[in-house]
């Protein structure tokens, strides 16, 4: 058993039918010695008397808010949450496995640049009685500071019969140098509590591996005289690290017909312009990627050919 | 401690091409190592990230773009003095700071070259003959070093008398390749910046 925060305790349980459970001793936070009784949640049934209460915790019915009283007056509370260990593996019932880029990916994180700022998000089908708290650091043995905001509900979507809720959090490394070569990963830790169930999720990454630039901006077409060709031009996104000659991007230019089945023409360039053939009803899209370290491509920026 | 913006004329920068080749070569070699050593801990998540140049060179700091010198987090106080007769920039405008930067890159390459050659000698003794260093990568390191053209003492190739532990050697190869790829990215960024300046 360990303390999550004041008066909230987590009991770690080997979780299988008929498991023996854990013996827990609760102590009433009071100078009083006698006349103390204990109750659980809203029930008035007295579970025991005395300054300490010993309970065998085996299932969720044994968790909840234990209160010690004296003569009708509340002395203190202890909220017991359960952390299930199924076959030696901590349970992951609260968050959905996003399965990208691999199974057991519960947290996903992205950074728009090398400033040390990043966003993480996760999914759940649970809509109520749910709280999250997020901590982060650079490295774990001698951790360096990363400050995270509060997790907020960022999207809701319907998936089949279920509603899916997306939560996200923004974090900023306290002293980040965009040019630094990372040798210690960023660690992100999310505590999740649903009713009386506690779970924790972690992700470990280097900023360089989660880079996803914003799409190129000011995408423009300039028709070339007496030709079906156009000059496409664009600019680096505002959010990308500077100087651009040091933090260079490479680009992919795509001409896509109206029908998804039509052949796509693609050109790769390090410049911020390209000459392509504009077909009727087609659109031109451009996306960006770090030129030297192949992390994710940005989303496409698009303009119609017409 | 940083790169001045006023640097040589465009097209006077032969190192950019070599640095791009270097990054391509090390990335290919790392990919090959990951595939060949699939049952070894060779992914970025599995390895310890070690930098063999730590406390010996200060490439990131010495090659910091001018725009980042205002960022206090970038200004570590590691100073190293280097020989300053680099010819990569073929220009008298080459400042002391730039020479320090290029000299630091040269020292990095020399250190990795020695490590890779020592490691290759061990891998050649492996009866499994599972993996060897790509000769192209070693050649590209050499070409960039020649383009940088610094005079420095040659570091003797390490030789060890004890029987090599091939498992450990292959894990060390993965660690080295990961670190060298990161350094190659920095070198490429620096060369691109200098070329544009």
């Amino acid at each position: 058993i360990w303390e999550l925060k004041k008066d909230v305790y987590v009991v770690e349980l080997d979780w299988y039918p008929d498991a023996p459970g854990e013996m827990v001793v609760l102590t009433c936070d009071t100078p009083e010695e006698d006349g103390i009784t204990w109750t659980l949640d809203q029930s008035s049934e007295v579970l025991g008397s005395g300054k300490t209460l010993t309970i065998q915790v085996k299932e969720f019915g044994d968790a909840g808010q234990y209160t010690c009283h004296k003569g009708g007056e509340v002395l203190s509370h202890s909220l017991l949450l359960l952390h299930k260990k199924e076959d030696g593996i901590w349970s992951t019932d609260i968050l959905k496995d996003q399965k990208e880029p691999k199974n057991k990916t519960f947290l996903r994180c992205e950074a728009k640049n090398y400033s040390g700022r990043f966003t993480c998000w996760w999914l759940t089908t649970i809509s109520t009685d749910l709280t999250f708290s997020v901590k982060s650091s650079r490295g774990s043995s001698d951790p360096q500071g990363v400050t995270c905001g509060a997790a907020t509900l960022s999207a809701e979507r319907v998936r089949g019969d279920n509603k899916e809720y997306e939560y996200s959090v923004e974090c900023q490394e306290d002293s980040a140098c965009p040019a630094a070569e990372e040798s210690l990963p960023i660690e992100v830790m999310v505590d999740a509590v649903h009713k009386l169930k506690y779970e924790n999720y972690t992700s470990s990454f280097f900023i360089r591996d989660i880079i996803k630039p914003d799409p190129p901006k000011n995408l423009q077409l300039k028709p070339l005289k007496n030709s079906r060709q156009v000059e496409v031009s664009w600019e680096y996104p505002d959010t990308w690290s500077t100087p651009h000659s040091y933090f260079s991007l490479t680009f992919c230019v795509q001409v896509q017909g109206k029908s998804k089945r039509e052949k796509k023409d693609r050109v790769f360039t390090d410049k911020t312009s390209a000459t392509v053939i504009c077909r009727k009803n087609a659109s031109i899209s451009v996306r960006a990627q770090d030129r030297y370290y192949s992390s994710s491509w940005s989303e496409w920026a698009s303009v119609p050919c017409s | 401690r940083n790169l001045p913006v006023a640097t040589p004329d465009p097209g006077m920068f032969p190192c950019l091409h070599h640095s791009q080749n270097l990054l391509r070569a090390v990335s290919n070699m790392l990919q090959k190592a990951r595939q060949t050593l699939e049952f070894y801990p060779c992914t970025s998540e599995e390895i310890d990230h070690e930098d063999i140049t730590k406390d010996k060179t200060s490439t990131v700091e010495a090659c910091l773009p001018l725009e980042l010198t205002k960022n206090e987090s970038c200004l570590n106080s590691r100073e190293t003095s280097f020989i300053t007769n680099g010819s990569c920039l073929a220009s008298r405008k080459t400042s002391f700071m730039m020479a320090l930067c290029l000299s630091s890159i040269y020292e990095d390459l020399k250190m990795y070259q020695v490590e890779f050659k020592t490691m290759n000698a061990k891998l050649l003794m492996d009866p499994k003959r599972q993996i060897f260093l790509d000769q192209n990568m070693l050649a590209v390191i050499d070409e960039l070093m020649q383009a940088l053209n610094f005079n420095s003492e040659t570091v003797p190739q390490k030789s060890s008398l004890e029987e090599p532990d091939f498992y450990k050697t292959k894990i060390k190869l993965c660690i080295l390749l990961h670190a060298f790829r990161i350094r190659a990215v920095t070198i490429d960024r620096v060369m691109s910046y200098l070329n544009a300046s």
Epitope: F60, D87, S91, T124 | -
Partner: antibody, heavy 112, light 107 residues
Amino acid sequence: EVKLVESGGGLVQPGGSRKLSCAASGFTFSDYGMVWVRQAPGKGLEWVASISSGSSNIYYADTVKGRFTISRDDPNNTLFLQMRSLRSEDTAMYYCARNPYWGQGTTLTVSS
Amino acid sequence: DIVMTQSQKFMSTSVGDRVSVTCKASQNVGTNVAWYQQKPGQSPKGLIYSASHRYSGVPDRFAGSGSGTDFTLTISNVQSEDLAEYFCQQYNSYPLTFGGGTKLELK
């Protein structure tokens, strides 16, 4: 006493469908992840699918992905395995399990 | 996929003996390994989880050990009711995979 009782097996033609059920008792079913495992005649054990408590996470073996669907009905303490596009190689004894307990199994035969 | 190899398909033993059933994973699975017992004509039953933890009610003559890629189920003081097939299983990553089984027979 913990009990898992499978039902729904039988003879099915190739390409056909079948839904297996597993009735659980003796434990708080909704609080536990569950799995389906199968065993072809005279062969070893093969994991088929898993479902977490609350159905938030579901995983399938590649051999059944897209054809089988695992689901649960917590109020009725029942686990299901909906099987479609059945093949002869799906012939096996199907067990539902929540370690260390396994049901007695239900036999599915896919044959024309 | 992780392959779990039980190299011995059959093992002969006598009542009162100590026997060790081995299992090898094709890659590191930490301690995320379980052992099952299946008696002829019956369904399997879980014995060990996390490589070395016994489920409650499992006799203490059953002991699991190992981590990484090499795992062992040891039955000390074999009883006649222990004559069965034993399967190892990894649950470190999906798909979950079982060993091919080792049948324990009387000499």
